[in-house]
């Protein structure tokens, strides 16, 4: 004989649990139906009557199968420095995200942003790191040898120094290298290629801790067929 299907409410077998989308009501001591997302329990079950569900009212929601007597209130409207990425519906809460140039300083448990803050700016000698701080703010990193940043920005990364046949002024962490104009009388002489390295710098990012000190400039003699090695070290 096929197993009988129990209709809610029903008393569970000793040691067994209620089925999916059911809950055990400790007062009725029965397995009863949960309400679907977008609804809430209007009337709890009894030993003989199942849960009665009702739709969530405007500006309230339930995201999961539930037996709550009241739907949850949607969060307040997004503030002027935020954008609404998910609207409040009967089945989901409103989600607010920070507009460009800001990060979320205080998140709600549902993932919406409660408070946005302006992104920190990295000062000359420091670029924006590829990873973010745990709170979503910009992380600044000192420009690695061979790279520089001459801006105060929340988006600019360290850029490679220009490569000169003849170097006029070496670059450092906060300035680019300056190349000398090529002299035609020197064209037959084996060239010394300059890979400009930053000089020690005391610059530090705005709103950030100071970075490590920089290595001094290095002059590399490469002969007439130079091979350029670019540093991949992090700063």
């Amino acid at each position: 004989l096929p197993a009988q299907v129990a209709f809610t409410p029903y008393a569970p077998e000793p040691g067994s649990t209620c089925r999916l989308r059911e809950y055990y009501d400790q007062t009725a001591q029965m397995c009863c139906s949960k309400c679907s997302p977008g609804q809430h329990a209007k009337v709890f079950c009894t030993k003989t009557s199942d849960t009665v569900c009702d739709s969530c009212e405007d500006s309230t929601y339930t995201q999961l199968w539930n037996w709550v007597p009241e739907c949850l209130s949607c969060g307040s409207r997004c503030s002027s420095d935020q954008v609404e990425t998910q609207a409040c519906t009967r089945e989901q809460n409103r989600i607010c995200a920070c507009e460009a140039g800001r990060y979320c300083a205080l998140k709600t448990h549902s993932g919406s942003c409660r408070q946005c803050m302006r992104l920190s700016k990295c000062g000359p000698g420091f670029g924006v790191a590829s990873s973010r701080a745990p709170n979503g703010n910009v992380l600044c990193k000192a420009c690695a040898p061979g790279t520089f940043s001459d801006t105060t920005s929340s988006t600019d990364v360290c850029r490679p120094h220009r490569i000169c046949s003849i170097l006029a002024i070496p670059g450092n962490a906060s300035t680019d290298a300056v190349c000398a104009p090529e002299s035609p009388t020197l064209s037959a002489i084996p060239r010394t290629l300059y890979v400009s390295q930053p000089e020690p710098t005391r610059s530090q990012p705005l709103d950030q801790e100071p970075g490590p000190s920089q290595t001094p400039s290095i002059l590399t003699s490469l002969g007439s067929t130079p091979i350029i090695e670019q540093s991949t070290k992090g700063g």
């Epitope: 007062t27 009725a28 209007k42 009337v43 009894t46 030993k47 003989t48 009557s49 009665v52 009241e70």
Partner: antibody
Framework: QVTLKESGPTLVKPTQTLTLTCTFS??????????VGWIRQPPGKALEWLAH???????YYNPALKSRLTITKDTSKNQVVLTMTNMDPVDTATYYC???????????WGQGTTVTVSS | DIQMTQSPSSLSASVGDRVTITCKAS??????IAWYQQKPGKVPKLLIH???TLQPGVPSRFSGSGSGSDYTLTISSLQPEDVATYYC????????FGGGTKVEIK
Amino acid sequence: QVTLKESGPTLVKPTQTLTLTCTFSGFSLSTLGMGVGWIRQPPGKALEWLAHIWWDADKYYNPALKSRLTITKDTSKNQVVLTMTNMDPVDTATYYCARMTGTRYFDVWGQGTTVTVSS
Amino acid sequence: DIQMTQSPSSLSASVGDRVTITCKASQNINKFIAWYQQKPGKVPKLLIHYTSTLQPGVPSRFSGSGSGSDYTLTISSLQPEDVATYYCLQYGVLWTFGGGTKVEIK
């Protein structure tokens, strides 16, 4: 307007059975989610839940008093009756009936009736 | 059975004071708690249900909070008309009242 009113004897003797009636208006016990419960309060003491009956006749009793209590309803008369056997002087109290919502809390109470158990 | 331990059993505070009453359940009651106010010689009146939902007509100085087994009723600014005994009721598993808190004015 929802109202409830308790009625019954003000004095009962020890070992006797107490019968209390709750007559209500403004709602019906044939309406889904409606219920009526009984609560008592000895002089100067806390409230104590006794029993409850739902629109579908499902009944619940305080486990400590279950053997002595019976709750019934007469939907057509808008009445709920509580009987309590083997009364004792410690059962002297004000007895209240109250409406219960579908989500199980008491929202409207009767004025209460004082019952004294004494020989 | 669920026991409800209410504290303090009595308190005396000045008008305008913030008053806090707590109820601790012997197990998780999933926010199914209501608070009642009973003035001397009167019937209990529902103030709050489902932990924090204020009944219509109840002054906003009354608020409720809590989860799991610990719950609180707060009167943000005590008024002379708040002199009463306050009871919690758990309705997560059957029904149990707390022992009551008598609130007086200093």
